[in-house]
């Protein structure tokens, strides 16, 4: 029977700069029941606080709700593991909420084949930003990426859409069924997961010729 091994805070993520969650990996438990606590203070503060919510983010997590989240402050946090034989502490982690944003995937992905008489046919893709993100405030710039592939293909074709919420793709294989997905990322932060796939059947008469 031993004191617990050193835990590690390995990830902090925020969906929208308004709340965030951090997760830690326990070290070895020393063969004994081990209790974990996350303590933090904000840069410039002397008072330490303990995690306000160990439940929302699942096991080995700390969730900071709206009232505990400030964009303009760096959080300095540490996890303490304690059993009957002693304690061990993680390294301190410095967290700036601005840089840990990972949005939810974009919503309302719509895909349509457009075949104008006077121009080349194209695939028209449209989506909406994730609900939790308020783009009106100007705090966020979201960038988008689209990926698509024929249903049975192994490789994805990736297109960067910038800040647009719609995109046209010209070169497609007629008669194929395509999967289309979109994801987003803030200017500082992480790519969201890909949105659920939308399927589109490309007509056999879809021509790529001029």
């Amino acid at each position: 029977q031993l004191p617990p091994g050193k835990p590690e805070i390995f990830k902090c993520r925020s969906p929208n700069k308004e709340t965030f969650t951090c997760w830690w990996r326990p070290g070895t438990d020393g063969g004994l029941p081990t209790n974990y606590s996350l303590t933090y203070h904000r840069e410039g503060e002397t008072l330490m606080h303990e995690c306000p919510d160990y439940i929302t983010g699942g096991p080995n997590s700390c969730h900071f709700g709206k009232q505990y989240t400030s964009m303009w402050r760096t959080y300095i946090m540490m996890v303490n593991a304690t059993n009957q034989m002693g304690s061990s502490f993680s390294d301190e982690l410095y967290v700036d909420v601005t840089y840990i944003v990972q949005p939810d995937p974009p919503l309302e992905l719509a895909v349509e084949v457009k075949q104008p008489e006077d121009r080349k046919p194209y695939l028209w893709i449209k989506w909406s930003p994730p609900t939790l993100i308020d783009l009106k405030t100007g705090w966020f710039t979201l960038l988008y990426e689209i990926r698509l592939k024929p249903e049975k293909a192994a490789e994805w074709e990736i297109h960067f859409a910038g800040q647009q919420t719609e995109f046209k793709i010209l070169s497609l294989h007629p008669g194929q069924k395509y999967l289309v997905q979109v994801r987003c990322k803030p200017d500082h932060g992480y790519w969201s997961a890909w949105s659920p796939a939308t399927f589109i059947q490309i007509p056999s008469d879809f021509t790529m010729n001029d």
Epitope: S37, G44, L47, P52, Q67
Partner: antibody, heavy 118, light 107 residues
Framework: EVQLVESGGGLVKPGGSLRLSCAAS????????MNWVRQAPGKGLEWVSS????????HYADSVKGRFTISRDNAKNSLYLQMNSLRDEDTAVYYC???????????WGQGTLVIVSS | DIQLTQSPSFLSASVGDRVTITCWAS??????LAWYQQKPGKAPKLLIY???TLQSGVPSRFSGSGSGTEFTLTISSLQPEDFATYFC?????????FGGGTKVEIK
């Protein structure tokens, strides 16, 4: 509606012990640090002790250190203050208060009176 | 320990008056200061936190300002229900401390 209800106060002789309780309802008790604050008759407020969400951070005023012990039971939504070696100067109304770490002591109980007298 | 000094200790005022209470900290506490109102036989009630943020449900005639070592609580137009004792509290470092209080009485 948030409610904090203290109990356990009463008359005790110097050197005696008392255990105060604070029952919380209408809040996610486990998400907040909790505090005891006291007020001697006709006097101001004095912070006594605080305890964090999972009891990993505990602090006491110098005047009670070594004599009082704060604890909590999140499963029972309850806060406690074990008071030993009581002195005349511990006579006061004892309040429990919720500490919203983003703000201050935003909810208080109605208080329980502790009288230490021979 | 950080000492908080409130001034004045007593204040006589009339309904409609503008009232200002000052709280000085013995060392800098940034904006980690709260103001409470207490009526006889009742628990304190939070009015202002982080020096200037009005607690939900508190009338807008109450306002707070200051940072560092000097803070003020202002009641823009005193109402009958505002006659009470007011305390400041620092939440910058342990031990958490309160000011001595300011009793606002009817003139």
């Amino acid at each position: 509606e948030v409610q904090l209800v203290e109990s356990g106060g009463g008359l005790v002789k110097p050197g005696g012990s008392l255990r105060l309780s604070c029952a919380a309802s209408g809040i996610t008790f486990s998400s907040y640090s909790m505090n005891w604050v006291r007020q001697a008759p006709g006097k101001g407020l004095e912070w006594v002790s605080s305890i964090s969400t999972r009891s990993s951070l505990i602090h006491y005023a110098d005047s009670v250190k070594g004599r009082f012990t704060i604890s909590r039971d999140n499963a029972k939504n309850s806060l406690y203050l074990q008071m030993n070696s009581l002195r005349d100067e511990d006579t006061a109304v004892y309040y429990c208060a919720r500490w919203d770490a983003a703000a201050a002591f935003d909810y208080w109980g109605q208080g329980t009176l502790v009288i230490v007298s021979s | 320990d950080i000492q908080l000094t409130q001034s004045p200790s007593f204040l006589s005022a009339s309904v409609g008056d503008r009232v200002t209470i000052t709280c000085w900290a013995s060392q800098g506490i940034s904006s980690y200061l709260a103001w409470y109102q207490q009526k006889p036989g009742k628990a304190p009630k939070l009015l202002i936190y982080v020096a200037s943020t009005l607690q939900s449900g508190v009338p807008s005639r109450f306002s707070g300002s200051g940072s560092g070592t000097e803070f003020t609580l202002t009641i823009s137009s005193l109402q009958p229900e505002d006659f009470a004792t007011y305390f400041c509290q620092q939440l910058n470092s342990y031990p958490l401390t309160f000011g001595g209080g300011t009793k606002v009485e009817i003139k």
